[in-house]
Structure formats: structure tokens, C-alpha cells
């Protein structure tokens, strides 16, 4: 009797178990009692990345330079093009359809992780003993100056945004 379920890499149609098309190929005609499934390779600008019964291949993603995108990896008949962002920009989503400038860490915050083409800058608050007095996408929190090592004393305490101010020690009279 006609099958109700098919093996892996097959599909059921008209009571037939037909072979799926391999990645990189699209379906031209279903199998019959007397013939195999017929498949054709995707064209140069197209792909299919799974065993499939698609009658159309998918277009490769276009990395639009107007959106700050560039090609990270060229697509094949079996894989999509991978886009990344130009320097100074990162993707707005996992699918990387557009780019935005890396954010800068405000004063009082330092760069924990420098941005890449696919991830934004990660900032962290400067802990006690550290400061950042600039808005930057690259600079980490810097340690307060150690007055003691310069044989000086703290004249003005540091904050997360400012360094300590050192001064000479008072002379004993």
C-alpha cells in the first residue's frame, strides 16, 4: 500500500516517497512511480542551505554600502552571503541588515569590550580607584594617580570622572 511516512531526506507526495533536493539545488519536478525527483542547481546569485523541495532558490543577501554594510563572507549555492559593518559601525540585529555607529562610553564609564562589526561597545562604571574623564569608544577606566609613589599627598580626592589631585606634603616645623 502507499506509504504514510518517508525516510530521512524524502517527502511524501501523491502517495510517493520522493527524494528531497540536496542543498544548492531546487525542485524541478516531483518523482513519480517511474521517475526520480528532478532538481536543478541554484544560479550564481542564489542559494538553498537545506535538503528541500523548494521550487525557487533564495537570493543571496545584499550587503548595502549605503547602510554601512560590507561582505564578510561571499555566498555559495549552499550558503547565504554574510554581511558585516564597516569600521566604526556595528549591526543593529543578528541578521545584520543595517549598521549604526559604535556608542562611546561617557565620562565615569570605561570600555569593557571594544565594539566589533557585529557587536556594540560594552561600557562599565569606573569602580572606586578608577576614572574616565572622556567620552570614548576605546578607552578603559584609568586608575587614579598614586600620590604616595611620587612622595606626594592627595590634595583632592578622585571621583569616577576625575583623577586625584596630588600636592606636596606639609613640612613639620
Amino acid at each position: 500500500e502507499p506509504p504514510t511516512a518517508c525516510r530521512e531526506k524524502q517527502y511524501l507526495i501523491n502517495s510517493q516517497c520522493c527524494s528531497l533536493c540536496q542543498p544548492g539545488q531546487k525542485l524541478v519536478s516531483d518523482c513519480t512511480e517511474f521517475t526520480e525527483t528532478e532538481c536543478l542547481p541554484c544560479s550564481e546569485s542564489e542559494f538553498l542551505d537545506t535538503w528541500n523541495r523548494e521550487t525557487r532558490c533564495h537570493q543571496h543577501k545584499y550587503c548595502d554600502p549605503n547602510l554601512g554594510l560590507q561582505v564578510q563572507q561571499k555566498g555559495t549555492s549552499e550558503t547565504d552571503t554574510i554581511c558585516t559593518c564597516e569600521e566604526g559601525l556595528h549591526c543593529t540585529s543578528e541578521s545584520c541588515e543595517s549598521c549604526v555607529p559604535h556608542r562611546s562610553c561617557l565620562p565615569g564609564f570605561g570600555v569593557k569590550q571594544i565594539a566589533t562589526g557585529v557587536s556594540d561597545t560594552i561600557c562599565e562604571p569606573c569602580p572606586v580607584g578608577f576614572f574616565s574623564n572622556v567620552s570614548s569608544a576605546f578607552e578603559k577606566c584609568r586608575p587614579w594617580t598614586s600620590c604616595e609613589t611620587k612622595d606626594l599627598v592627595v590634595q583632592q580626592a578622585g571621583t569616577n570622572k576625575t583623577d586625584v589631585v596630588c600636592g606636596p606634603q606639609d613640612r613639620q616645623r
Partner: antibody, heavy 112, light 112 residues
Amino acid sequence: EVQLQESGPGLVKPSETLSLTCTVSGYSITSNYYWNWIRQPPGKGLEWMGYIRYDGSNNYNPSLKNRVTISRDTSKNQFSLKLSSVTAADTAVYYCARLDYWGQGTTVTVSS
Amino acid sequence: DAVMTQTPLSLSVTPGQPASISCRSSQSLENTNGNTFLNWFLQKPGQSPQLLIYRVSNRFSGVPDRFSGSGSGTDFTLKISRVEAEDVGVYFCLQVTHVPFTFGQGTKLEIK
């Protein structure tokens, strides 16, 4: 249901061209399947002559030595057989078939 | 060409008894995908052939379950578990793995 019906002259003179048409109903010949011509000489077995595919491409039996042509008219959902330079040996019942469905067959006699 | 040899060429069976027909090919009928396109047909007296079994062992729709097909490679068998009067006619195997498609010479089944 799929139905196939052969039509054409029942008598052909030697050296002339045999022409038959198969009209298909219940299924488009451009959708899928291979559309075959098969013949059966009197008291003998079946011989595959060739097919035209759903996409219009062909395959023929080399034993017929380039005498056979299968074509189609998609607007009428028909496919046709032409067999040139016929002899008495081409006298047979001619069937058009999708293989799961067959026409009822038409007898062609080659005689002067 | 794949030459198809059927045995026996004739068979006389008592109703209710089993019958078996063999079809042997001169070359393997398994294709590169592991599929085997071997089919069985029955041609009843005065009728067109009708499909019984396709792809070695699949019964075509409407075919009684007393008909079964088996085999692989080059050796194939059609079995009728309990022959009935309506089963009389000529049984053909047909391979469509290789072009040209080729038929067995036929096995005539009669009722005792």
C-alpha cells in the same frame, strides 16, 4: 481521472510516414510524467518507442534508427508520434501511455 | 540495452492456488540513488496493459492485495497468492531505470 486516446489512420502505405496523436484529459502533459508511445505487433510482445517529457524533451528507442519523432501541442494537451519509412514490420497496435494509464490502442496496418 | 527475461512463458493454475512469475534483467536496475524502477503489468485479453506493481513492490491503486512484487538488482518476482478467474492474461515486466525502456516477453496465465 487521467484518460488517453489515440487517433490516426489505420492504414499506411510502405515507405510513407505513420502519424498518430494522443489526446490526454484529466492531467496536463506539461505538469509532470513522461508521455510514451509503445507498440505491440500481432501476437508479439510490447516495444517501447520513446517518450516526450513534461518539459518537452525526448528520448527514443535506438532500435528505431532515427525514424521516430515525438512532439506535442500543449494548447490541445496532445502528443504525437511520427514514424517514417514504414514497412510491413511496423504493423502493430500502437498505445500512448503515461505507464500508470494507457490509451485503448489503435491498430495500424502497413500495406499497399 | 537491459534485456528482460521472463519465466515461465506460460502458466496454468487452479483457482485459489498461488502463482509466481520471474523477471531477470541483464544488468542491475538499481540506480545511483538506490531506487529500482521495475514494474509489472497485466494485459487482459483484448485490453490495454494495466499497471499492477511499480518500483518493485508497490501495488498500484485498486490492485488487489493478492498481488505482490519483490526482488532487487537483477532478479524480480511477481506473486499471486490465490489466483482468480479474472487474473487470466499476459503478465509483463518493464524496466524504466535505463533508456531504452525494455519489456519482458510476457507470461501467459491460464486457469485450469
